[in-house]
């Protein structure tokens, strides 16, 4: 089947401090030497990506230095890290991978990851 | 709004050049990988190439490879396709059409008439 | 390369009528990569379908899609005017990027 299957877990609670992390895995086709992985969320039936990096099979990925990702690679496997989120982000975290090097090239698109995010209570003045 | 509008199309000679450029606006042109899109007078949609991202990635159909040149210019949010030693078989409208988040071609220009 | 080809090539039906378009693949393809497109006389193409069967923004729900393995169809429940059109299905999972040779929905 000329088609590339990612696997994702269905749903990640963050942490308290608006982390959360998943494991993204391809099937791959071929014998990749350049990957690209974007995450997209998808909430309300709108789309927005919200990272993308690309990186030689091997090698670290590198996001933007802005951005609020961060990941390392491991063979067919992208352990991917989302901070900075707040509770208004929970939604659907899709990972979508691209085999852009050497041809042919191939998509593959998650499920995607439900990512809860609750924000934490507001610690109470105490009176002493 | 999502727009592309392709220009440079005309008519030409067998074996002469012609350059196509495709105008994108009203998304981050660089987030995205763009393909040329063909069609025939009559005929059905044949994919022509397409160019990835930051530009260093392209693939072509077997039909125009080693004639055709895709390539970008993100600071100008613009396309091109160099097409070298046309034939009579390359006459069509060329689209240009932004590969999706998901993966179709989810916004297509108006197309360019090359005779 | 993945050859699609659709069935049939002209599909004549009065405005009301349920269309049926079929688009067999050469190989197994994971329908998940598998798109629709209408075209219209002089028009550029436009994306209906994604992924099989998720229609794109904008898309009426009389438009829908399904399938899997080698065989995906494209169904519309009841023709209006604006239909009557040519309509491609397109692999986009794997590089060359393949569409179909057509259907044209033309009315009765």
């Known amino acids: 089947c000329k088609a590339m299957h990612v696997a994702q877990p269905a749903v990640v609670l963050a942490s308290s401090r608006g982390i959360a992390s998943f494991v993204c895995e391809y099937a791959s086709p071929g014998k990749a030497t350049e990957v690209r992985v974007t995450v997209l969320r998808q909430a309300d039936s709108q789309v927005t990506e919200v990272c993308a990096a690309t990186y030689m099979m091997g090698n670290e990925l590198t996001f933007l230095d802005d951005s609020i990702c961060t990941g390392t690679s491991s063979g067919n496997q992208v352990n991917l890290t989302i901070q900075g989120l707040r509770a208004m982000d929970t939604g659907l975290y899709i990972c979508k991978v691209e085999l852009m090097y050497p041809p042919p090239y191939y998509l593959g698109i998650g499920n995607g990851t439900q990512i809860y995010v609750i924000d934490p209570e507001p610690c109470p003045d105490s009176d002493f | 709004q999502v727009q592309l509008v392709e220009s440079g199309g005309g008519v030409v000679q067998p074996g002469r050049s012609l350059r196509l450029s495709c105008a994108a606006s009203?998304?981050?042109?660089?987030?995205?990988?763009i393909h040329w899109v063909r069609q025939a007078p009559g005929k059905g949609l044949e994919w022509v190439a397409v160019i990835w991202y930051d530009g260093r990635n392209k693939y072509y159909a077997d039909s125009v490879k080693g004639r055709f040149t895709i390539s970008r210019d993100n600071s100008k949010n613009t396309l091109y396709l160099q097409m070298n030693s046309l034939r009579a078989e390359d006459t069509a409208v060329y689209y240009c059409?932004?590969?999706?988040?998901?993966?179709?071609?989810?916004?297509w220009g108006q197309g360019t008439l090359v005779t | 390369e993945i050859v699609l080809t659709q069935s049939p090539g002209t599909l004549s039906l009065s405005p009301g009528e349920r269309a049926t378009l079929s688009c067999r693949a050469s190989q197994s393809v994971s329908s998940s990569y598998l798109a629709w497109y209408q075209q219209k006389p002089g028009q550029a193409p436009r994306l209906l379908i994604y992924?099989?069967?998720s229609r794109a923004t904008g898309i009426p729900d009389r438009f829908s899609g399904s399938g899997s393995g080698t065989d995906c169809t494209l169904a519309i429940s009841r023709l209006e005017p604006e239909d009557f059109a040519v309509y491609y299905c397109?692999?986009?999972?794997?590089?060359?990027?393949?569409f179909g040779q057509g259907t044209k929905v033309e009315i009765k």
């Open positions: 992924g099989a069967s």
């Open positions: 009203g998304f981050t042109f660089s987030s995205y990988g």
């Open positions: 397109q692999q986009y999972g794997s590089s060359p990027w393949t």
């Open positions: 059409a932004r590969g999706g988040n998901w993966g179709p071609f989810d916004y």
